[in-house]
Interface confidence: low
């Protein structure tokens, strides 16, 4: 993959940008699309062949304070008879999101962005079989 | 999480709520964790509700690359490797926070943005609607 040869120069910083101290950035935590809602199919965590439960984690020094994590209920998957089939595996599906962490150091408060790995749900997979020689 | 006790002599500044605008250290904690779902696992191929990953790119956003899942089938893959339409492949969606440049193109000025991403797919029993 080569850099294409088209007439466009390096990105230049606009003059209208707010001044920011070195080593930091200005972050507005008034969220764009704050009221957007997830339109997932109903109760998929219970109807899935790899069902999961939700746990809410709470941290007042994190923004957002509430982060929901999923945990797979079974090692195997649920078959058509409603029984656990251990020839298949329930595995977590994960996604990264950003949070803002508030840190107290003496009387000063600082803010740090942090990537958090959220388990979103589970899926049923065929296991990888390792053959021992 | 752990609440860090404050020095009682400190002025009470935004104790409960976060201020609307904050100055944040440029280094993101856990920034270099590998977030390419194609590299981190092959669940998207091995799942009974397999999905394809589509690259969504926006240079005005961090992260600039987000992978969107699209279920390959309406049904799920059965033990014989065929699509079983008695079951449904459905996307698992998640709201995530990203950074949006504000004003546009500025190097160190951002606003949090909530976006909805499909992370993967799962196989579910369909909801059957009986017609009276």
């Amino acid at each position: 993959r080569k850099i294409p040869k088209v007439g466009h120069t390096f990105f230049q910083k606009p003059e209208s940008c707010p001044p920011v101290p070195g080593g930091s950035m200005k972050l507005d935590i008034g969220i764009i699309n704050e009221n957007q809602r997830v339109s997932m199919s109903r109760n998929i965590e219970s109807r899935s062949t790899s069902p999961w439960n939700y746990t809410v984690t709470w941290d007042p020094n994190r923004y957002p304070s509430e982060v929901v994590q999923a945990q797979c209920r079974n090692l195997g998957c649920i078959n058509a008879q409603g029984k656990e089939d251990i020839s298949m595996n329930s595995v977590p599906i994960q996604q990264e999101t950003l949070v803002v962490r508030r840190k107290h150091q003496g009387c000063s408060v600082s803010f740090q962005l942090e990537k958090v790995l959220v388990t979103v749900g589970c899926t049923c997979v065929t296991p990888v079989i390792h053959h021992v020689q | 999480g752990i609440t860090i006790p404050r020095n009682p002599g400190c002025p009470n500044s935004e104790d409960k709520n976060f201020p609307r605008t904050v100055m944040v250290n440029l280094n993101i904690h856990n920034r270099n964790t590998n977030t390419n779902p194609k590299r981190s696992s092959d669940y998207y191929n091995r799942s009974t509700s397999p999905w394809n990953l589509h690259r969504n790119e926006d240079p005005e956003r961090y992260p600039s690359v987000i992978w969107e899942a699209k279920c390959r089938h309406l049904g799920c893959i059965n033990a014989d490797g065929n699509v079983d339409y008695h079951m449904n492949s459905v996307p698992i969606q998640q709201e995530i926070l990203v950074l949006r440049r504000e004003p546009p193109h500025c190097p160190n000025s951002f606003r949090l943005e909530k976006i909805l991403v499909s992370v993967g797919c799962t196989c579910v029993t369909p909801i059957v609607h009986h017609v009276a």
Epitope: G7, H8, F11 | P59, R61, P63, V65, L99, H105, F110
Partner: nanobody, 119 residues
Framework: ESGGGSVQAGGSLRLSCAAS????????MGWFRQAPGKEREGVAA????????YYADSVKGRFTISQDNAKNTLYLQMNSLKPEDTAMYYC?????????????????WGQGTQVTVSS
């Protein structure tokens, strides 16, 4: 890319990457390297609109990434080179604000220049 070559441990090299342009406003430029039999790893990255560069822990204090907007050129000054720095070095460009040292964040790649450090 240019500027690669063979050097003794403790020596220096300066890599250059001349870019002709982009299909969209490129925000990140980075240097990556790949040693034989190893995965490609990020070395250093810079946001072309300003701000602090990022470095892999293994090169901090020894390598410096810089840019010359007038010449549309990216540089990597490599000092105190070690045998473990031996690799093919690639220049890369892509979008994104933080310019992380993760290769799939970068869309455009150079052909690479070989750096060999002998003890």
């Amino acid at each position: 890319e240019s500027g690669g070559g063979s050097v003794q441990a403790g020596g220096s090299l300066r890599l250059s990457c001349a870019a002709s342009g982009w299909t969209f406003s490129t925000l990140c430029m980075g240097w990556f390297r790949q040693a034989p039999g190893k995965e490609r790893e990020g070395v250093a990255a810079i946001y072309t609109g300003g701000g602090s560069p990022y470095y892999a822990d293994s090169v901090k204090g020894r390598f410096t990434i810089s840019q010359d907007n007038a010449k549309n050129t990216l540089y990597l000054q490599m000092n105190s080179l070690k045998p473990e720095d031996t690799a093919m070095y690639y220049c890369a460009a892509g979008g994104g604000g933080y310019c992380p040292l993760i290769d799939y964040e970068y869309n455009y790649w150079g052909q690479g220049t070989q750096v060999t450090v002998s003890s």
